[in-house]
Interface confidence: low
Amino acid sequence: GITNINCSGHIWVEPATIFKMGMNISIYCQAAIKNCQPRKLHFYKNGIKERFQITRINKTTARLWYKNFLEPHASMYCTAECPKHFQETLICGKDISSGYPPDIPDEVTCVIYEYSGNMTCTWNAGKLTYIDTKYVVHVKSLETEEEQQYLTSSYINISTDSLQGGKKYLVWVQAANALGMEESKQLQIHLDDIVIPSAAVISRAETINATVPKTIIYWDSQTTIEKVSCEMRYKATTNQTWNVKEFDTNFTYVQQSEFYLEPNIKYVFQVRCQETGKRYWQPWSSLFFHKTPETVPQVTSKAFQHDTWNSGLTVASISTGHLTSDNRGDIG
C-alpha cells in the first residue's frame, strides 16, 4: 500500500487518519529532501492531483483542506518540485479512511440449530460504519460466573462444548472501531430454550381424485425433540397472501397433512417448526410446488422443472426445492 513507500518527509492528517465521515480535514505535507528547497508542493488523492484548497505554510510544509469529506477510503501522497529536478520528488503517502462510530448492537439473538454443535449468535449492527469494526461477544455463565469473550467481525458460532458453566448465560455484544465503542443490552438465555429443531422438509405431495379432490402433503424432520409445533403455509403461485395451518407434531413418523384445493392451479408450500412453547422458529423450508389436476391426475417433478402427466388415480409432486428469500422476521 501507499504506507509502505520510502518517505523523504512526512504526511499527516488532522484530526486523524481515520475520521468521522463528513468532517472537514486537513492533510499536511512536510518535505525533507536533501539539497531541495521545494518550489511547490503537490497533493494527490487516488493518483489524481488536487488543484484547490492548498496552502503553503512555510518553505517545507503545505496543507490541503477538504470540506465535508465523504469518501470511505482514499490514498493520499504528496510530492515536491525541486530546482534542477525534471520530475516531482515523492515525499510521503498515507491511506485515510472516513466512517462512523458503531451503533449500539441490538436484537441480539442466540440459537442452537439441532445437531449443529454450535450456538449461533447474531445481532443488528446498525448503520454501515465504512471502517473496520470488530465485535466482542461476551458469554457469562449465571451459574459459575465464568465469562468468555469471542472476537468477530460479524456473527459468531460458539461451540456448545465450550459452554460448560451450566445452561443459563448472559450474552452481550460490544462493537468497536477507531471512532467509538458501544455495548448492547444483555440477553439472558437458557440453552434448552434456544434449540431450533432439525429442518422440516416437504418430500412429496399427491392429490387423491375422490368426489372432493384432496391433496396430501408429506413432510418430515430428523429432530429428536418430542414436542414440536409446526406451521405450513401455502398459496396459489398467482396469489400474494399465504394461508397458514398449524400442527402439533410428533416426528416418529412422516407427517401427512390434508388440503382441499382448487383444481388446475399451481400451489406453493412451505413448512417451519419450533420446539413447542419456545421462542425461535426454523426458517421457512424450501419452496415446494404442486399443481392440482383438472380431471386427469398429473405428476409434477421439480427436479425437471416441468409438468408430466400420469394416468393413475393420484397426482403426486416431488421437489428438490430451492431456497426462499422470504425469511425475514422468522427468527425472533
Epitope: 451459574e143 459459575t144 460466573e145 465464568e146 468468555q148 461451540s159 456448545t160 462444548d161 465450550s162 459452554l163 460448560q164 458453566g165 451450566g166 445452561k167 437458557h190 440453552l191 434448552d192
Partner: antibody, heavy 119, light 111 residues
Framework: QIQLVQSGPELKKPGETVKISCKAS????????MQWVQKMPGKGFKWIGW????????KYTDDFKGRFAFSLETSASTAYLQISNLKSEDTATYFC????????????WGQGTLVTVSS | DIKMTQSPASLAVSLGQRATISCRAS??????????MHWYQQKPGQPPKLLIY???NLESGVPARFSGSGSGTDFTLNIHPVEEEDAATYYC?????????FGAGTKLELK
C-alpha cells in the same frame, strides 16, 4: 458407559507435591467440565473447584487458591489435581466428578484417591 | 457462601419404616425455574452416588422409595420403605451459585 478412574493412594511427607489423575471414558472429554472435591476423614465434602475441559481454564474456591492446581491432558481424556507444599491437613480423599451442565449435580464420580500427608 | 445445615446428624430406622432427612440452606437455592438442591448417598469406601437432583427428580436407576421435596431454603429427602442396603450417609448439596457447598451429612442406621 461413563467412567472416571482415578490414580491410586499416595503417602507423602509435608512440603512434597502430589499429582492425582482422573481418566474419563464413555463420553467426549472436552464437552463437560471436571470438578474436584475433597473429603477429609470424619468430615463433610468440600468443593475445590473445576476446570473447563474445552478452554483449560481452572476455577478454584477461595479455600483452595494457591497450592492446588488443575490441569488437563486432553489427548488422554485425563484431568489432574496437583497439590504442592503438602500439609498434614491436606490428608483427605480427593474425588474428581462430572457435573451435569443443566443441574450442577455431580452425576458421575471417580472412586477417590486417598492422600496421606505424614512425616 | 451458602451454608447447608443437615438434620439430624444421625438416625436409626426400622426396616420398612420411613426415614426423613432435612437440609436447610442459609439462603434460597431456588429460581423461578428450578430448585438447585441435590441429594447423595455414600457408603464406606465408595464415592457418593447421586439420588435426587433439582430437589425432586429421581436419578436414573435409583429406586422409587427415594423421594425429594422442598423449595427455597428447606428441603427433605424421604426413604420409604427403608431397606437394609439403605444404611449409609446422606448428603445434600446446592448448585445455585459458586461455591457449591455440601451439608455435613446424616448417617442412617438400621435398628
Amino acid at each position: 458407559q461413563i467412567q472416571l478412574v482415578q490414580s491410586g493412594p499416595e503417602l507423602k511427607k509435608p512440603g512434597e507435591t502430589v499429582k492425582i489423575s482422573c481418566k474419563a471414558s464413555g463420553y467426549t472429554f472436552t464437552t463437560v467440565g471436571m470438578q474436584w472435591v475433597q473429603k477429609m476423614p470424619g468430615k463433610g465434602f468440600k468443593w475445590i473447584g473445576w476446570i473447563n475441559t474445552h478452554s483449560g481454564e481452572p476455577k478454584y474456591t477461595d479455600d483452595f487458591k494457591g497450592r492446588f492446581a488443575f490441569s488437563l491432558e486432553t489427548s488422554a481424556s485425563t484431568a489432574y489435581l496437583q497439590i504442592s507444599n503438602l500439609k498434614s491437613e491436606d490428608t483427605a480423599t480427593y474425588f474428581c466428578a462430572r457435573s451435569s451442565a443443566l443441574t450442577g449435580a455431580f452425576a458421575y464420580w471417580g472412586q477417590g484417591t486417598l492422600v496421606t500427608v505424614s512425616s | 457462601d451458602i451454608k447447608m445445615t443437615q438434620s439430624p446428624a444421625s438416625l436409626a430406622v426400622s426396616l420398612g419404616q420411613r426415614a426423613t432427612i432435612s437440609c436447610r440452606a442459609s439462603k434460597s437455592v431456588s429460581t423461578s425455574d428450578y430448585s438447585y438442591m441435590h441429594w447423595y448417598q455414600q457408603k464406606p469406601g465408595q464415592p457418593p452416588k447421586l439420588l435426587i437432583y433439582l430437589a425432586s427428580n429421581l436419578e436414573s436407576g435409583v429406586p422409587a422409595r427415594f423421594s425429594g421435596s422442598g423449595s427455597g431454603t428447606d428441603f427433605t429427602l424421604n426413604i420409604h420403605p427403608v431397606e437394609e442396603e439403605d444404611a449409609a450417609t446422606y448428603y445434600c448439596q446446592h448448585s445455585r451459585e459458586l461455591p457449591r457447598t455440601f451439608g455435613a451429612g446424616t448417617k442412617l442406621e438400621l435398628k
